[in-house]
């Protein structure tokens, strides 16, 4: 049976205000995905979050209230990975160039790209404004946080036989109850101060033996750097 023992992310908690300063909301009249600010003019998100028009919202905590720290910047370029596969969600990563530079401050700042792949057991922070109910709909206004460990590739593949590529990894709890969910896509998985993952997919949310699946950012560092250089 689905877990419904908490009402955050699923099973997380209210982030302290602006404590995740690299977290962005992608908006098309409503929040549809998250993202991560990696430099003053570029955001990393999921390839499946592609839309032709995106407004990037930085400095957000409560996405339904103007709190005074927000920066709303339209996307100038939206570049999905050339090998993105909609059917398998392999290469599920996208870069967004902002139409103007973000103003970096205590509430809006960048997150580092990884220098090594994610290690099994590492505790990471997942954040987003996604559904907080594992069944039904309960979308929060305030940013939700979840602390969760990187799972071994063997456990990840056992959870999703034949579906996990080398560009994916699992984070979460095999017992269920804590997970990212709909609306969290594209958002960050940060481990030891580095952006290791992008929220991608999963079988439901917070289900037993069905952890969240995330894009392995480490595999795309070269593509990210080359793409930014070619579009600056």
């Amino acid at each position: 049976a689905p877990f419904d023992d908490d009402d955050k992310i699923v099973g997380g908690y209210n982030c302290e205000e602006n404590s995740v300063p690299y977290q962005v909301s992608l908006n098309s009249g409503y929040h549809f995905c998250g993202g991560s600010l990696i430099n003053e003019q570029w955001v990393v998100s999921a390839g499946h979050c592609y839309k032709s028009r995106i407004q990037v919202r930085l400095g957000e905590h409560n996405i339904e209230v103007l709190e005074g720290n927000e920066q709303f910047i339209n996307a100038a370029k939206i570049i999905r990975h050339p090998q993105y596969d909609r059917k398998t969600l392999n290469n599920d990563i996208m870069l967004i160039k902002l139409s103007s530079r973000a103003v970096i401050n205590a509430r809006v700042s960048t997150i580092s790209l990884p220098t090594a792949p994610p290690a099994t057991g590492t505790k990471c922070l997942i954040s987003g404004w996604g559904n907080t109910a594992s069944s039904g709909a309960d979308y929060p206004d305030e940013l939700q946080c979840l602390d969760a460990p990187v799972l071994s590739q063997a456990k990840c593949e056992a959870s999703y036989p034949g579906k996990i590529t080398s560009n994916m990894f699992c984070v979460g709890f095999l017992e269920g109850g804590k997970d990212s969910c709909q609306g969290d896509s594209g958002g960050p998985v940060v481990c030891n101060g580095q952006l290791q993952g992008v929220v991608s997919w999963g079988d439901g949310c917070a289900q037993k033996n069905k952890p969240g699946v995330y894009t392995k950012v480490y595999n795309y560092v070269k593509w990210i750097k080359n793409t930014i250089a070619a579009n600056s």
Epitope: F32, A46, H48, C49, D138, W201, G202
Partner: antibody, heavy 125, light 107 residues
Framework: QVQLVQSGAEVKKPGASVKVSCKAS????????ISWVRQAPGQGLEWMGW????????NYAQKLQGRVTMTTDTSTSTAYMELRSLRSDDTAVYYC??????????????????WGQGTTVTVSS | DIQMTQSPSSVSASVGDRVTITCRAS??????LAWYQQKPGKAPKLLIY???SLQSGVPSRFSGSGSGTDFTLTISSLQPEDFATYYC?????????FGGGTKVEIK
């Protein structure tokens, strides 16, 4: 501009089948989904089903399961809706409508922003 | 299935009037609701999406509000071209469901 253009009116006998087409233009067909909605004379709107243009994943209204098939042809940016074993109460205007694709853990939102002009299907003996 | 109940089923109003239409979902749908306008012989037209976002090209006299189970469409000053039937639609989950419609007629 973004538009959906549907095939012309059809008159069918009970027990027959009908296949309505919906040709998309002005946007990347595979970045969106298509819903089919029908409206019987003087009645409200009834959702029939949904198809992802990129994967052909479908979700059909329970009352039409087994009688309806939705398909897409990405080479021509066209969606199709076939309804079999037609009955008189299938007489309606049939609409296709564009909606956001829903993938992975993005927000699932099933609104419809662009509609076809409608195809009248009359079932009569 | 999520049932959508619209009220009133019809309303008579004059040009310049403020008109309010309500829609209630049988279970919570967060902000995932759309409003459409339909004129006789025409396809529905999207007015409001995600409960309160105004679709591009739609006049600002149309507004939407609500979250959870209760939603409202407001026309602040009714114009002659606004006489039509209005439908709400829950956009949260399959099966997609519509309200029964509200016909706005000339008084």
């Amino acid at each position: 501009q973004v538009q959906l253009v549907q095939s012309g009116a059809e008159v069918k006998k009970p027990g027959a089948s009908v296949k309505v087409s919906c040709k998309a233009s002005g946007y990347t067909f595979t970045d969106y989904a298509i819903s089919w909605v029908r409206q019987a004379p003087g009645q409200g709107l009834e959702w029939m089903g949904w198809i992802s243009a990129s994967t052909a994943d479908t979700n059909y209204a329970q009352k039409l399961q087994g009688r309806v098939t939705m398909t897409t042809d990405t080479s021509t940016s066209t969606a199709y809706m076939e309804l079999r074993s037609l009955r008189s109460d299938d007489t309606a205007v049939y609409y296709c409508a564009r909606g956001d694709e829903v993938v992975g853990k993005m927000t699932y939102y099933y609104g419809m922003d662009v509609w076809g002009q409608g195809t009248t299907v009359t079932v009569s003996s | 299935d999520i049932q959508m109940t619209q009220s009133p089923s019809s309303v008579s109003a004059s040009v310049g009037d403020r008109v309010t239409i309500t829609c209630r979902a049988s279970q919570g749908i967060s902000r995932w609701l759309a409003w459409y306008q339909q004129k006789p012989g025409k396809a529905p037209k999207l007015l409001i999406y995600a409960a309160s976002s105004l679709q591009s090209g739609v006049p600002s006299r149309f507004s939407g509000s609500g979250s959870g189970t209760d939603f409202t469409l407001t026309i602040s000053s009714l114009q002659p071209e606004d006489f039509a039937t209005y439908y709400c639609q829950q956009a949260n989950s399959f099966p997609i469901t519509f309200g029964g419609g509200t016909k706005v007629e000339i008084k």
